[in-house]
Interface confidence: medium
Amino acid sequence: KETAFVEVVLFESSPSGDYTTYTTGLTGRFSRAGATLSAEGEIVQMHPLGLCNNNDEEDLYEYGWVGVVKLEQPELDPKPCLTVLGKAKRAVQRGATAVIFDVSENPEAIDQLNQGSEDPLKRPVVYVKGADAIKLMNIVNKQKVARARIQHRPPRQPTEYFDM
């Protein structure tokens, strides 16, 4: 299981009309459910139950966005509509270029994602937990324009923020 280096860029408008970007680096793991590839796209937060709906009109963008899913404690969803792997597949079917799962509340999901699949997804499926997951969800919950860049090498110039 390789380390996934995730840069999350939050865009905040400035009075000049351009934007200040705040870049946060965090690490996760590429799961065996998907490919060990770089990916980038606008973050779309997805509720685990939202991935149950099989309505084709519920897909998001044709182009690659990064789905972020915070998994709940298994006790809160004793009979899930889909396995975690199934949820990853559904997100990719809807156009996600990558899926990031916050597994902090559901660590058993790691094993599910890492079970050797005969047909792994062609897009990365990353999981994060602990402090990295908290950092990610803090940004996602701001509901501002945020972008994720997933790399399998550390970014060359990690920065806390830069002004555009």
Epitope: F11, D18, E40, M164
Partner: antibody, heavy 120, light 109 residues
Framework: EVQLAESGGGLEQPGRSLKLSCAAS????????MAWVRQAPTRGLEWVAS????????YYRDSVKGRFTVSRDNAKSTLYLQMDSLRSEDTATYYC?????????????WGQGTLVTVSS | DIVLTQSPALAVSLGQRATISCRAS??????????MHWYQQKPGQQPKLLIY???NLAFGIPARFSGSGSGTDFTLTINPVQADDITTYYC????????FGGGTRLELK
Amino acid sequence: EVQLAESGGGLEQPGRSLKLSCAASGFTFSNYDMAWVRQAPTRGLEWVASILTSGGTTYYRDSVKGRFTVSRDNAKSTLYLQMDSLRSEDTATYYCARHGVGSYDWFADWGQGTLVTVSS
Amino acid sequence: DIVLTQSPALAVSLGQRATISCRASQSVTISGYNLMHWYQQKPGQQPKLLIYRASNLAFGIPARFSGSGSGTDFTLTINPVQADDITTYYCQQSRKSRTFGGGTRLELK
């Protein structure tokens, strides 16, 4: 102030190649997705291609897939469009455009355009 | 492709309200995102972004421009119309690929 300056247009024969360039200034080029959009009097505005910030992800309209290649040099703040196997229907004014911040849904800023004419 | 239909021309009086419509061949509203955007193009110039995601005013655009709509029907409103606004307006969707409407020419009554 955001400035996008296209160059490289001109008259070319069908089947030949042309390379367009777009020099960007007034913003941090590497932070933005970029695109090419064309406009012909007969067909109106048509999105041609987009490239995301790092240059590793590209998208094309169906009619140019396999013929056109969009690329970027972040160090030079320059966007390119390599056009091969040109067809008469590629005749248009080609605009370089900066996508919206953090999103490749809309085109926030446009250059003045460069005219490409494909004719024998 | 999603086809965007605009009426070719609209006649207005200066100081009045102009309502330009754009109809999509299928819904461009997905998960709360209205993926419709509006541009102005003056003769001999490049297009200029006015409104993104249906109702967000682009930076530097006067507040007399506004956008609304969801699903398949979207509207660009100019109120009040000024002489400088007499030009062509295009809608653009980003639900599937990116396509533009044919444009609506604003004309003086």
